[in-house]
Amino acid sequence: MRRGPRSLRGRDAPAPTPCVPAECFDLLVRHCVACGLLRTPRPKPAGASSPAPRTALQPQESVGAGAGEAALPLPGLL
């Protein structure tokens, strides 16, 4: 099933992202990039020794799978 445009309410984005399902929206340059090939380590479980990464999106601005979703570290990436 094709996913419709995904919306972003952070970082001054005026409109839904035009990305197709296989793409991710890169907030630094504000355009879609292929993300299906990226190796994304799983987020550390709660209680891990180092603090969980705090994303710059506020909870009410969460995107993707839903509010409270952990950020996935992508070493280097894109």
Epitope: C24, L28, R30, A56, L72
Partner: antibody, heavy 126, light 107 residues
């Protein structure tokens, strides 16, 4: 060990060219975005350029646009900076660095540079 | 271009002191602010990302706070190895920009 080892610096005359290299090891280079950053003697850090993991996108700082080219060879795990029409003000220590990002849902968030090379000195002088 | 202004440009402190460095952005950058430490002749080292997240391996005496335009790096108890220059950097938009640094010297 995650490492970036740089080479290619030196003394060059104004108007000439130079190519810097940055050899990566200890991580999946082909999945990593990369930057060049420079620091003139006694000055602030200045971002030079960034390249996507697959080379599909490149962005440059205004001061080098049209003169410098960032590129990469993923088969050799190496990043390059081709510097043409060099000027006195390009004299600096040049660093390569890995782009640090996180994926939240379908959005890629940028958090700076988490691995740096040792730096290589470029001196532009007649 | 987003301009980052750091203050002070230098400071003198003693081992054990609490040190605070500020970084102000010329426009709102949400929490896309990172802090680096650089020692003479060495490459910068990432300390804090996303304004307040401690990079792996960095001692917990380092902390960051702020959002929007005003940010702070705090060293709770200065150690001998902390004497260095500290830079802020925004990753909100290209061109990426850095502050001009705060040099922490021994009093």
């Amino acid at each position: 060990e995650v490492q970036l080892v740089q080479s290619g610096g030196g003394v060059v005359q104004p108007g000439r060219s130079l190519r810097l290299s940055c050899a990566a090891s200890g991580f999946t280079f082909s999945s990593s975005g990369m930057h060049w950053v420079r620091q003139a003697p006694g000055k602030c850090l200045e971002w030079v350029a960034v390249i996507w993991y697959d080379g599909s996108n490149k962005y440059y700082g205004d001061s080098v646009k049209g003169r410098f080219t960032i590129s990469r060879d993923n088969s050799k795990n190496t990043l390059y900076l081709q510097m043409n029409s060099l000027r006195d003000e390009d004299t600096a220590v040049y660093y390569c660095a890995r782009r640090f990002t996180m994926l939240r849902g379908w959005y890629i968030e940028d958090y700076g540079m988490d691995v740096w090379g040792q730096g290589t000195t470029v001196t532009v002088s007649s | 271009e987003i301009v980052l202004t750091q203050s002070p440009s230098s400071l003198s402190a003693s081992v054990g002191d609490r040190v605070t460095i500020t970084c102000r952005a010329s426009q709102s950058i949400s929490s896309y602010l990172n802090w680096y430490q650089q020692k003479p002749g060495k490459a910068p080292k990432l300390l804090i990302y996303a304004a307040s997240s401690l990079q792996s391996g960095v001692p917990s005496r380092f902390s960051g706070s702020g959002s929007g335009t005003d940010f702070t790096l705090t060293i709770s108890s200065l150690q001998p190895e902390d004497f260095a220059t500290y830079y802020c950097q925004q990753s909100y938009s290209t061109p990426l920009t850095f502050g001009c640094g705060t040099k922490v010297e021994i009093k």
